[in-house]
Structure formats: C-alpha cells, structure tokens
Amino acid sequence: SERCDDWGLDTMRQIQVFEDEPARIKCPLFEHFLKFNYSTAHSAGLTLIWYWTRQDRDLEEPINFRLPENRISKEKDVLWFRPTLLNDTGNYTCMLRNTTYCSKVAFPLEVVQKDSCFNSPMKLPVHKLYIEYGIQRITCPNVDGYFPSSVKPTITWYMGCYKIQNFNNVIPEGMNLSFLIALISNNGNYTCVVTYPENGRTFHLTRTLTVKVVGSPKNAVPPVIHSPNDHVVYEKEPGEELLIPCTVYFSFLMDSRNEVWWTIDGKKPDDITIDVTINESISHSRTEDETRTQILSIKKVTSEDLKRSYVCHARSAKGEVAKAAKVKQKVPAPRYTVE
Amino acid sequence: DGCKDIFMKNEILSASQPFAFNCTFPPITSGEVSVTWYKNSSKIPVSKIIQSRIHQDETWILFLPMEWGDSGVYQCVIKGRDSCHRIHVNLTVFEKHWCDTSIGGLPNLSDEYKQILHLGKDDSLTCHLHFPKSCVLGPIKWYKDCNEIKGERFTVLETRLLVSNVSAEDRGNYACQAILTHSGKQYEVLNGITVSITERAGYGGSVPKIIYPKNHSIEVQLGTTLIVDCNVTDTKDNTNLRCWRVNNTLVDDYYDESKRIREGVETHVSFREHNLYTVNITFLEVKMEDYGLPFMCHAGVSTAYIILQLPAPDFR
C-alpha cells in the first residue's frame, strides 16, 4: 500500500482504564499530531480506521465492532468500550486516510484490575490543596462525555476504603468534594464512583486521585537563606579544604521553580578555572516546603581563593535573594623562639 | 544564645511617618511562640509601652512616627517551647519630600512601591498599609504628580484605586495618603508608587511561527554538552505538536538506546492573544556523527533546523 505518515507508538499517552468499566478513548491524531480536527477531516472525505495489536502479539488485527451489546464501538474520533475486559489490553492504532493521504498513530491501552479498596497499578493524578486556606474542592476527573447532561448520575466519594459520610471537614457535593479547611490529615487517596444508567444497563466509573496538602500561598515567603549568614566566618589556611553550605528554605509555591546557585567573584563556578565541586541535597517538609543545600567545596584552597567573594543565590516565584559567605585567611599563630 | 538566624529583610522607608513591621515566619510563628524585638543587638527589648514612639505591639514593631535616626538593624526573636529563631530587619530611613523628587530616584524599591497597570483594561493600584490592629486607618486619598486624583475613570475603594480603561497617560508617580489614629493621636501615612503601563501583546497569523532556530549552523566543540531551545509562537487554541526530530524520527526514539540526545519538557508562557512555547534539545555529549546532520524543530506545519559544525581551527 502507499506510504502512510506513521507517528509510531505514542508512549506519552499510557492510557489506563479499569476493567469492567466504560472507557472512551479519543484518537490522538487530532489531539496531538494533526492541525485539523475530526469534523474537518470527515468533511474533507477522510475516513478514520481503528485496529489493534493484542498484548504480547505482533499481529495487527481489525477491531471487532460486531460484539454483543456493541461492547466496542466508534463514534466520530472516539473508541468506546462498554465495558472493558482485561484482555482488551494492547496497542491501538487509529489511521486517517483517503486515496491520497494517510496518517496513523498507535497508543498503548492497559486494562487494570482494582480491589475492593480501589487499589490498583493505576498511576494516580495528584491534586494539591493549600493547608488551612478556606474551602477548596476537588472534582471527579475524566467523566465528561460518558453520559448526556440530562442523565443525573449518583456519585459516591471514598477516602481510601471508607465512604465519606459525616466527615468533619470533607463534604461530598455531587461531582465535587469540598474540603472546608484542608489539614495534613486529609492527605490520601480519594475515589469517586459515578453510577449512571444507559440503555437499561448500569455503568460505574471509578476515578481515584491523590490529595496532597501543601503550604498555603498566604504563608509563602521569598526564599530564606539560613546559611551562609553573618554569624559564621569560614576561616581557612591555604591548603585546607573549604566547605561552605548554602542552605535555603523555600515556601511551597504551586508551579514555582526553586533554584540555588553559587557565584564566585560574580561568575558561575563553571566559568572559572578553580577546582570547585558543588553537591546538592533537597529535603521536603510535610507540606512540601523545600530546603535545598548546595555545598561548595574547594579541596585545597589557595590564599587567592580566600580573597574571593562567595555568594549564594536563591530564586523562587516569590523573589530572588543572595547572601555572601564571610571567608578569610586564618592568621597563623605567632611563633616564639627562645634565644 | 542558641538562637538560629533565619533571615534578613531590608526595608527602605520614609521619615516622619508611621511604620510597622510584623515578625512572622510561617514555619515557626504558626505555633505557640513568644516574640521579642531588639534594636542593633541590644540586650534590652524594645519597649511595650504604647505611649513610646517605638514600641512592640503583639508581634509588630511600631514606629510612631519613624525618624531619621531610626535606621539600623532590628532583631526579632521568636522563642518556642524548644526552639529559638531570630529575624533581622535592616531599616534604612530617608528624607522623602514627595512632591520634590521623583520616586524613581529611590534605591531598590519593593514591589509595593512599583506597580503595573494593563493598557485598555479596568485595573487597580493598591495602597499597602501594614499596621497592627491598634492602628485605625482613615479613608485613603490618591494623588498623581502631587494632584489629588479626580475623574470618572477613577474610584477609591477600600485600599484600592480602581482605574477604568487604562491609558498610556496613566503611567507616572502616584501617592496614597491615609490618616492613622493610634491612642488618640493622628499621623499621616504617605506611600509613593511608581506606575508603569504594560502594552497589549499583538500576534498575527494562525500557523505556528518558529522564532528560533532559523535554519542555521552552530559551532560547537566535540565532546561538549549543548542545549538548544526551539521557541514557537502559536494561537491559544492550537492542537499542534512541537518536537525535535532527526532523520524524520523523534530524537527520543532515534537515541532510545544511548539517551545521549533528548528532547526536553515543553514549557509555555501565555500571552493575551497567543502562547510562546519552548522545547529544547540536549546533546549530553556532541559526537562526530552529529556534525552536518539537520536537527529539525517541528511545530505543526512549521519546521526549522540547526546543523552542528566543528569550530574553525585557530591558527594563532
């Protein structure tokens, strides 16, 4: 057959779905690879074809759309499972073509099992809530498009294994779960089970996400340099090892990049000829405030090195700070000679 | 004394008006702690008598008013059950005659004194007044270039000056003034604010535009690490893929075994009419086989390449 633009296996989209639940999977061509949408393609006379390769097989085979109760069907650019089975796991390909044009992409689909407490190998999205920040909500994710707005589903929320009922500060409100005042004790996995009717059958959608309570923006401060400070002087003799820790506290800030770096005489260590090594360690508090330590080390310091300016810099979305270390050459003790 | 120094704050302030600083450091002051203020490493705490010109009010240090001689380093000591932390506040007091000099002449103004209005929008300026509960603030008046602001485009609402349909003429030097009452005495607070105007970002065209690279070569030494950004502007609602390819294959797939050349994580900055995307390519170590090969940045239907070249020999 004529050449087809093959985008290969799109491993960026590791699609995981639960066994025995409906799943709707959009053809990634229109999401990530092509400039036009399905309607444009369809009206231009292009056809969307689906096929798959079973797990541990090399053979591409067409998808059977003639299963009882239309278990697998296609609607526009969506492949529907009503519901999934464990052996639906495999690589799925959608191909868009006419006589002169062809483009296709494959993606892996994994059908996973869950236990009665919703534990599974599913990768869980993480939703961060600010500590003691007032009312915050999480919304049951990825349920759009499963049922029309005229259908009113029932939604049950769980924390871990327990149904959320009469919890102190967590209130189910339909598709939303409200945290009146988020506390560390609210950390954990939350599951919404959406139950809806369709053509005389009842389907369940299970969605689990991890809630992580993090530092509040109300409490966020610019980076704080604990060390170096004005109270510690790094006094060394030439030939000794110079070790200066730069320890910086960063408040948790959503999507902020925390950076720490040293300059020596105003230059980055990479841009100067002296033999400097820098080791970094990072630790986090329970609310994801971060402490970064960068230890600047010069194995055999020279008297020239002891005259340089060593400045630790830190930056976050809250601002930039800098602090110079006090470095000086140790004055040798006077030597007395007996005449 | 076993106290841990945690940070130094620099404040530049105007003489002859009230000033207050609250000693808070969230990881520490959220618990049960006692706070004591000292001046210039003195062992004697700042007075807590409310009639004193400088006194501690709960966790605040309050100057009623600030005087030129008050410059210096103040320490606030936060003691917990089994912890002690110290914050240093370096206060620099200057004589500021609001209508004589431009606020632009002040050193290192904080963001509170430099604010932005967005052209064409209904926007606002904030008068930052940080004082303890014992201080009662009266209504705020706003000035621009020393004249009280009047006109239907401006409304004073609480600590804000609301500005309708911001124009380029709105840039300039503003001041907000409030009367502060403490223990029956009145003081004037006047904050200067330098206001700049941000322009609307214009963007035309619906095909992604690769700003960089521009189909050119880069001289790079053998064995070095190289990172090249691909910068793309595209419409907000685009569904275009942005990626680096070599020999018509995604670099991550092409170098799947060695992982020597990798595509970075895409980031973007959102503008009014468009997004600016950046996706980089990292050569952990440039090898001979990389020279002369076009590394293509793709963005939807747009492409641009870089070609690595050995630097010309230096015959000096």
Epitope: - | G120, K121, D122, S124, E152, T155, L162, S164, R272
Partner: antibody, heavy 118, light 107 residues
C-alpha cells in the same frame, strides 16, 4: 454584539450547592470586571459579587460571603458562581453583568432562575 | 453599607408629562451614581452613569443631576415605552447598593 448568557439555575434544596455559569461574547472579556446581581421574585436588585479582569480583586455582598465563590476563565470567556449552603432567601433571578467604570453595569444577561425550596 | 432611598415608590403620570425621580444616599457618594430602567421580564438597562452622563443610545429626554447625597433622574417628556421601574445604584463603596426602585406607571 455584546452578549452575556447565564446558565445553571434550577430548583435546589436548602443546604445544597449549585454552580452558575455566564458565557460572554462580543467584547474583550479579559479587559473588564464582571459582576453577579440578583433579583428576588417581585423585589428590587441586589448586588452579589464582583471579580476583576485577572481575578486579583474579588468582592461579595455580606449576605453571601463565605458561601458563594466567584471565579472566571478568561480563556473560555466564562464567569462562574459556585453557591454552597443555599438558603431559601437566595431564591432569585441571577444576572451576570459587565462592569463599566468598574462598578456600574452597562450590559446584562437575561438571567437564570435559582429556586431554593424543600 | 450605603443605603439608597428612592422616592416616590410609585409615580403615576401620563405620556408627555415630565417625570422627576429622587434618590438619596445615607452618606456622600460623590458623583458615583447610576440610574437603570427595568421593564417586566427584561434585564435592567443602564441609563445614566456618574450622576449626569447618558449611556450609549439613551435618548436625550433622560437626564441626571446631583452629587453627594441627593440625586435626580428627569424624563422631560414621557414616551409610552418609558413606563417601567427605575433603580439608582452607587459605586462609591463596597458593597455596591441599589435603591428600592420607583415605578413609573400610566395614569
């Protein structure tokens, strides 16, 4: 032509929640503050909430403070009002309105009716 | 909050007559006052803003005056489509407040 279209109203029991939406078109949505104003059946107008162009300034009437949350999505030209712990006295026609000179209202939607009743 | 009191509650007039509506504020609102017209089953419509400025497409028979605490909306010669409820609103302070309304009805 400037248009504001509210949706999401309906009958709800006291103590429950409702989320109203307002879809805007015909003007540069992210240049303006947008407000919610309500009108109880047969009664006058009551201002409910305001949100500035960049969500930096938000204001509420005392009667809804702590229960209602206003938000906006400039990318979608949409305004929202999340109403929790609803009371019978919240029964009203809810309008969204474009701010003019910040706090006057030069364009209004047709309103969405919220009925709180057991 | 600033309370706006409108008077009279109802005004019965014939087409062609002059209508004078009053709005009094419990404290000064400078000139930050607007007037709206509302017909049954419709959303309000901005008539006057900042006490005296006519909004876009508002006929010249509508005029506003006043500042501080006392404001007036005048309709110089009533047209049949002017019979409606009129509200004043202040933007001097949050919460924004409306008057209770004046109903202009056909005599």
């Amino acid at each position: 032509e400037v248009q504001l279209v509210e949706s999401g109203g309906g009958l709800v029991q006291p103590g429950r929640s409702l989320r109203l939406s307002c879809a805007a078109s015909g003007f540069t949505f992210d240049d303006y503050a947008i407000h919610w104003v309500r009108q109880a059946p047969g009664k006058g107008l009551e201002w409910v909430s305001v949100i500035s162009w960049n969500s930096d300034i938000i204001g509420y009437a005392d009667s809804v403070k702590g229960r209602f949350t206003v938000s906006r999505d400039n990318a979608k030209n949409s305004l929202y009002l999340q109403m929790n712990s609803l009371r019978t006295e919240d029964t009203a026609l809810y309008y969204c309105a474009k701010g003019y000179n910040w706090n006057f209202f030069d364009y209004w939607g047709q309103g969405t009716l919220v009925t709180v009743s057991s | 909050e600033i309370v706006l009191t409108q008077s009279p509650a109802t005004l019965s007039l014939s087409p062609g007559e002059r209508a004078t509506l009053s709005c009094r504020a419990s404290q000064s609102v400078s000139s930050y006052l607007a007037w709206y017209q509302q017909k049954p089953g419709q959303a309000p419509r901005l008539l006057i803003y900042n006490a005296a400025n006519r909004a876009t497409d508002i006929p010249a028979r509508f005029s506003g005056s006043g500042s501080g605490t006392d404001f007036t909306l005048t309709i110089s010669s009533l047209e049949p489509e002017d019979f409606a409820v009129y509200y004043c609103q202040q933007r001097s302070n949050w919460p924004l407040t409306f008057g209770g309304g004046t109903k202009v009805e056909i005599k």
